[in-house]
């Protein structure tokens, strides 16, 4: 950055190089150039010469004043006009930053995604600070009193192998930057209560042309958790409101759920699960589309899903299945 240049004098900022956004600040430049009594001192911000609010303090020093400084980052340097010199002489430069102290981290959440081998902790960091902000996640065993600390700039993955202090822990987050420090409330967790089962996936759908046509949704999960509660939500793509069906599931076989739907309408389905009686849900699965036929049977597979609806006996359409849900991160 600009701070790596060779200086012939120095530049400093008051109140500090990193300051609260919206403050009034002063940038001082003091020349120390051999055989030069500066005729004029110039300030540059991001390479552009500043014209106003410059005050000469003495023969070697000048001040640039900014009111209500709102830029997150700026590179400042100053130069001197020396007699008998064609060009301006560089004095020094400095990178300055403005931002905010961190908010109190809240909504601290720790989950173990099945098969991940990690406990993932996240939180709401609050408003953007604009400056480098670090988070220290404290994990304290309620059984051994031992505390571990993890430094991160966002969320943290903690190997479950490193959680040797039993099953019960307190977790809290400290946020710190150059402008301040805040600490979250403590979250008490039990490792057995925060496991989220392996993702549930809708694999295919078919509509059976009986007296009352019936749509069967096939869905599955790789979970080895025995008692799982799931929700499937569905709606016509033209509707705003979801219908929700609840299931107590064990995935010893592929699940089949029956729906009595209106003919010739495109529906969208999603599923999510949680370990029965526990706190956190999976995110909703990818959107799965199925159009009910007018009269003929219809099979829709997750592997195929373009909007190719032909008239004929059985129509199969196939999709990549990579459409994401409208609230993927809903784990609470």
């Amino acid at each position: 950055g600009i701070t790596n240049i060779n200086c012939s004098g120095h530049i400093w900022v008051e109140p500090a190089t990193i300051f609260k956004m919206g403050m009034n600040i002063s940038i001082y430049c003091q020349a120390a150039i051999k055989n030069c009594q500066p005729r004029k001192l110039h300030f540059y911000k991001n390479g552009i010469k500043e014209r106003f609010q410059i005050t000469r303090i003495n023969k070697t020093t000048a001040r640039l004043w900014y009111k209500n400084f709102l830029e997150p980052h700026a590179s400042m340097y100053c130069t001197a006009e020396c007699p008998k010199h064609f060009q301006e002489t560089l004095i020094c430069g400095k990178d300055i930053s403005s931002g905010y102290p961190p908010d109190i981290p809240d909504e601290v959440t720790c989950v173990i995604y099945e098969y991940s081998g990690n406990m993932t902790c996240t939180w709401n960091a609050g408003k953007l600070t604009y400056i480098d902000t670090k988070y220290v996640v404290h994990v304290k065993s309620l059984e051994t009193e031992e505390e571990q600390q993890y430094l991160t700039s966002s969320y943290i993955n903690i190997s479950t192998d490193s959680l040797q202090g039993g099953k019960k822990y307190l977790v809290w987050v400290q946020a710190a930057n150059a402008l301040g420090m805040e600490e979250s409330k403590q979250l008490q967790i039990h490792l057995d209560d925060i496991v989220i089962p392996s993702a549930a996936v809708i694999s295919r759908a078919e509509t059976i042309n009986a007296t009352v046509p019936k749509t069967i949704i096939y869905w599955d999960s790789q979970t080895t958790i025995e008692k799982v509660s799931c929700e499937m939500r569905y709606k016509a793509t033209t509707n705003q409101t979801w219908n929700v069906k609840e299931f107590d599931t064990n995935f010893t076989y592929v699940q089949q759920s029956e729906f009595y739907l209106e003919p010739n309408i495109k529906y969208v389905f999603q599923v999510r699960c949680q370990e029965t009686g526990k706190r956190y849900w999976q995110p909703w699965s990818s959107l799965f589309f199925h159009k009910t036929p007018e009269t003929v049977p219809q099979v829709t597979s997750k592997a195929f899903q373009h909007d190719t609806w032909n008239s004929g006996l059985t129509v199969a359409s196939i999709s990549t299945g990579h459409l994401t849900s409208d609230n993927r991160g809903d784990i609470g």
Epitope: E114, Y115, G117, Y218, D220, Q222, T252, Y253
Partner: nanobody
Framework: EVPLVESGGGLVQSGGSLRLSCAAS????????MAWYRQAPGKQRDFVAA???????NYADSVKGRFSISRDNAKNTVYLQMNSLKPEDMGVYYC??????????WGQGTQVTVSS
């Protein structure tokens, strides 16, 4: 049906080690979970360990740190390395294969006996 063939069971002293293998006659991919369950006499079949096609693993609390599950996709085989065996680890160990959106398959089982 995809048969699963377990091997590697036997008699071992307390504190000893065994390595179980389970070979599937069909290939398996990232949508397949392979697992081991065990059944002690007069008890229900309990989950021991599982491994996904992408290498994610899961263990029962009672075996964490002692048992290790792995799979070799090229050989269509899953392994269970069992160290520091205890008498309570004794039972018939069953291999289990689950294909996402597809079949579930059990092996015939292999006996593990731990003598104190």
């Amino acid at each position: 049906e995809v048969p699963l063939v377990e091997s590697g069971g036997g008699l071992v002293q307390s504190g000893g080690s065994l390595r179980l293998s389970c070979a599937a006659s069909g290939s398996f991919d990232s949508d397949t979970v392979m697992a081991w369950y065990r059944q002690a006499p007069g008890k229900q079949r309990d989950f021991v360990a599982a491994v996904t096609g992408t290498g994610g693993t899961n263990y029962a609390d009672s075996v964490k740190g002692r048992f290790s599950i792995s799979r070799d996709n090229a050989k269509n085989t899953v392994y269970l390395q069992m160290n520091s065996l205890k008498p309570e680890d004794m039972g018939v160990y069953y291999c289990y294969m689950r294909i996402l959106g597809g079949g579930r398959y059990w092996g015939q089982g292999t006996q593990v006996t731990v003598s104190s």
